[in-house]
Interface confidence: medium
């Protein structure tokens, strides 16, 4: 079967992933709510350009979760 | 013996929801790829929706994108269909399939879903 | 519209030859495998041929399957009156998604 990873992330999932901790040390006191709340201001105020490389990125990861997906079809038979 | 066994047709109002489910037995549940496929009466048949096996990953037909999602319970063995703002064009048996290297080796007997006023 | 094209309905007659075409894309059906499904309406589908041309066990050897380019068909020898039913074939896209030919009506004369 394939290695697939747990999720395909969007770009906005791994522009959460790089800043979530950061805006936890600065307020530790927000809820998780208000974290995912502040995210969503934060990306949409985000310009195209510096969007970018996550959504290259995220790119990057959806042609290789195709790849495992193909390479895992072109291996046979069925049991 | 492997068996695919879904539920959870019916009729429904156009607007409604339904959910579907499909009991696995027979094989590991968890390590494949699972799909719906629907035939509309007198139509061909229509992949719907497939899920990897860690149910992390899912694609689906551009027909119910936004409106369908496909979810699995690997400790219950079942797959999931949820349909919302269904369509009279959503009318169709609904089978869910077990893949293995890109074909369906197994297919359940099919659950009928009728979105009518 | 399906993305695999497949002629509505086909016939002959007992002991003869059939086949029936399924014709696709580069992105389908020339870079993948191609499987065939023989289905009686109401029941579930049967896995017929995978892998272009491969039988599963049970299958009588007089369902064949090959591909070409773009191109796959299904051909049945000593046609029989229990053949009479839906054939269809499928190959697979990007991701997870998969394709369907429309579905062949093959009829026993």
């Known amino acids: 079967d394939p290695n697939a990873p747990k999720r395909l992330p969007s770009a906005f999932f791994l522009f959460c992933s790089e800043y979530r901790p950061k805006i936890k040390g600065e307020h530790p006191g927000l809820s998780i709510g208000d974290v995912a709340k502040k995210l969503g201001e934060m990306w949409n105020n985000t310009a195209a350009d510096d969007k970018q490389p996550y959504e290259k990125k995220a790119a990057k990861l959806k042609e290789k979760y195709e790849k495992d997906i193909a390479a895992y079809r072109a291996k046979g038979k069925p049991d | 013996e492997v068996q695919l066994l879904e539920s959870g047709g019916g009729l429904v109002q156009p607007g409604g929801s339904l959910r579907l489910s499909c009991a696995a037995s027979g094989f590991t549940f968890s390590k494949y790829i699972m799909h719906w496929v629907r035939q509309a009466p007198g139509k061909g048949l229509e992949w719907v929706s497939g899920i990897v096996p860690s149910g992390g990953l899912t694609e689906y037909a551009d027909s119910v994108k936004g409106r369908f999602t496909i979810s699995r319970d690997n400790s219950k063995n079942t797959l999931y269909l949820q349909m919302n703002s269904l369509r009279a064009e959503d009318t169709a048996t609904y089978y869910c399939a077990k893949e293995i290297f890109g074909q369906f080796d197994y297919w359940g007997q099919g659950t009928l879903v009728t979105v009518s006023s | 519209q399906s993305a695999l094209t497949q002629p509505p309905s086909v016939s002959a007659a007992p002991r003869q030859r059939v086949t029936i075409s399924c014709s696709g894309s580069?992105?389908?059906?020339?870079?993948?495998?191609v499987t065939w499904y023989q289905y009686f309406p109401g029941k579930a589908p049967k896995l017929l041929i995978y892998?272009?041309?491969q039988r599963p066990s049970g299958v009588p050897d007089r369902f064949s399957g090959s591909k070409s380019g773009t191109s796959a068909s299904l051909a049945i020898t000593g046609l029989q009156a229990e053949d009479e039913a839906d054939y269809y074939c499928q190959s697979y896209d990007r991701g997870l998604s998969v394709v369907f030919g429309g579905g062949t009506k093959l009829t026993v004369l």
């Open positions: 580069t992105s389908n059906i020339g870079n993948n495998a």
């Open positions: 892998s272009d041309n």
